[in-house]
């Protein structure tokens, strides 16, 4: 069979080889397409409800005024010339539709190095067959599941037209110290060959390099956090970051209802003050960062102070 590729909505003429150029003709066309079950026979004398999709022209050719998805299939003509010689024509028709230019929507203006970021979503509407979307970085293809690249794809089909909408969401993890203005683009490759790819306009997000966070240090006096009853404990939260973050305090994993301060003083320690303390530094740009936890415990005279304390009560300290 001869392969024919036709664009959806365009007319198509299939020649019936060996047919006399004008009536009377002894010929018939047989169709096996999405509009038929098994074979539908069309003849020159026909003329009827099928004319809107396929009709035999006076010269014996089959005319399809506007090819549709349902017209994909096999078309055969059997013709007899004036001398009684029989000729057969056989066509395999495939249809296609080129979508509009793909677009990148919901694109990010800024990416953070070292963490996964959504770059954007590439959308192509109105293709047939579906085709594929692919992403490019600085003109080179991006391979999903390699080097921090992941792609989420979705294909939808229009219930009436049968055309496809493709969506592809790109996630990347930019390398630290990499290109500060990478260029991303997306391209649609048609499902049928011999049609070139369609590419989106490029996007160039900035890559933001977060300053590596230095650890939040919690210093306790007396060292080890063991103190005699009535003694004083001073907890100091040291954060090298500038500007200084807000410091909040936690006891046994629960925030203490105190205003922010880098120093927490526990005077006249009693059993209710025993427990595990930590501080939380909140940076405007990073979010919260918690220190290690220290245990505060009471030692009776004559005991050696433990380095890890015991369960505490609910007393509140004072802030320096």
């Amino acid at each position: 069979a001869q392969n024919i590729t036709a664009r959806i909505g365009e007319p198509l003429v299939l020649k019936c080889k060996g047919a006399p150029k004008k009536p009377p003709q002894r010929l018939e066309w047989k169709l096996n397409t999405g509009r038929t079950e098994a074979w539908k026979v069309l003849s020159p004398q026909g003329g009827g409800p099928w004319d809107s999709v396929a009709r035999v022209l006076p010269n014996g050719s089959l005319f399809l005024p506007a090819v549709g998805i349902q017209d994909e299939g096999i078309f055969r003509c059997q013709a007899m010339n004036r001398n009684g010689k029989e000729t057969k024509s056989n066509y395999r028709v495939r249809v296609y539709q080129i979508p509009g230019k793909p677009e990148i929507v919901d694109s990010a203006s800024e990416l953070t190095a070292g963490v996964p970021n959504k770059v954007g979503t590439c959308v192509s509407e109105g293709s047939y067959p579906a085709g594929t979307l692919s992403w490019h970085l600085d003109g080179k293809p991006l391979v999903p599941n390699e080097k921090g690249v992941s792609v989420k794809e979705q294909t939808r089909r229009h219930p009436e037209t049968g055309l496809f909408t493709l969506q592809s969401e790109l996630m990347v993890t930019p390398a630290r110290g990499g290109d500060p203005r990478p260029t991303f683009s997306c391209s649609f490759s048609p499902g049928l060959p011999r049609h070139r790819a369609l590419r989106t306009a490029p996007i160039q997000p900035r890559v933001w390099e977060p300053v590596p966070l230095e650890e939040v240090q919690l210093v306790v006096e007396p060292e080890g956090g063991a103190v005699a009853p009535g003694g004083t404990v001073t907890l100091t939260c040291e954060v090298p970051a500038q500007p200084s973050p807000q410091i909040h305090w936690m006891k046994d994993g629960v925030p203490l209802p105190l205003p922010p301060s880098p120093v927490l003083i526990l005077p006249e320690i009693g059993p209710q003050d025993q427990g595990t303390y930590s501080c939380v530094a909140t940076h405007s740009s990073h979010g919260p960062q918690e220190s290690r936890a220290v245990s505060i415990s009471i030692i009776e005279p004559g005991e050696e102070g433990p380095t890890a304390g015991s369960v505490g009560g609910s007393g509140l300290g004072t802030l320096a």
Partner: antibody, heavy 119, light 107 residues
Framework: EVQLVESGGGLVQPGGSLRLSCAAS????????MTWVRQAPGKGLEWVAS????????YYPDSVKDRFTISRDNAKNSLYLQMNSLRAEDTAVYYC????????????WGQGTLVTVSS | DIQMTQSPSSLSASVGDRVTITCRAS??????VNWFQQKPGKAPRRLIY???NLADGVPSRFSGSRSGTDFTLTISSLQPEDFATYYC?????????FGGGTKVEIK
Amino acid sequence: EVQLVESGGGLVQPGGSLRLSCAASGFTFNNYWMTWVRQAPGKGLEWVASIDNSGDNTYYPDSVKDRFTISRDNAKNSLYLQMNSLRAEDTAVYYCARGGDIRVGLDVWGQGTLVTVSS
Amino acid sequence: DIQMTQSPSSLSASVGDRVTITCRASQDVGIYVNWFQQKPGKAPRRLIYRATNLADGVPSRFSGSRSGTDFTLTISSLQPEDFATYYCLEFDEHPLTFGGGTKVEIK
């Protein structure tokens, strides 16, 4: 809303002529074939004529061929049926319907207009 | 020409009954059959298109099926508003041919 409204029916003598009209709205008229169907009093439905989108091709059953002519004016979203040499057996309610080809069948109908052929 | 033989020509049924109407085509018409409902003094209304597809706004108690050249309209549970005349139509070839109609009456 898709709508078809017929007009032009009435009483006519045998051998006379009548022209029916159908005004279409609510859809892209020139995308569809159009069809006339009739129904004699107390009887079933009978196909009368069809016309393709462009108006280039028309189709009739033998019972009305050479007497009736279907036409359309896409600029006016209008369908027509010119009926000549009318007979008593043409008495019926005439309906205008959208479609008539394999893509649609007949999907939307007008309310009908009564044609009475009698002396 | 294709003949569409519709049966029965009339039937009596009660609300809640399952009703089946059949059209037999005299030759292959593929899937190109519509079903219509018509009430007295009104225009036909399409119920089923291409043999098995429910038209927009039509209650799901109506369904169409096909076996070769036999086409069936089924009303799964007859409602008071379903008492009417039903017609099939083949639109695979000219002349377009309607079945003779089935009048569904209250028992």
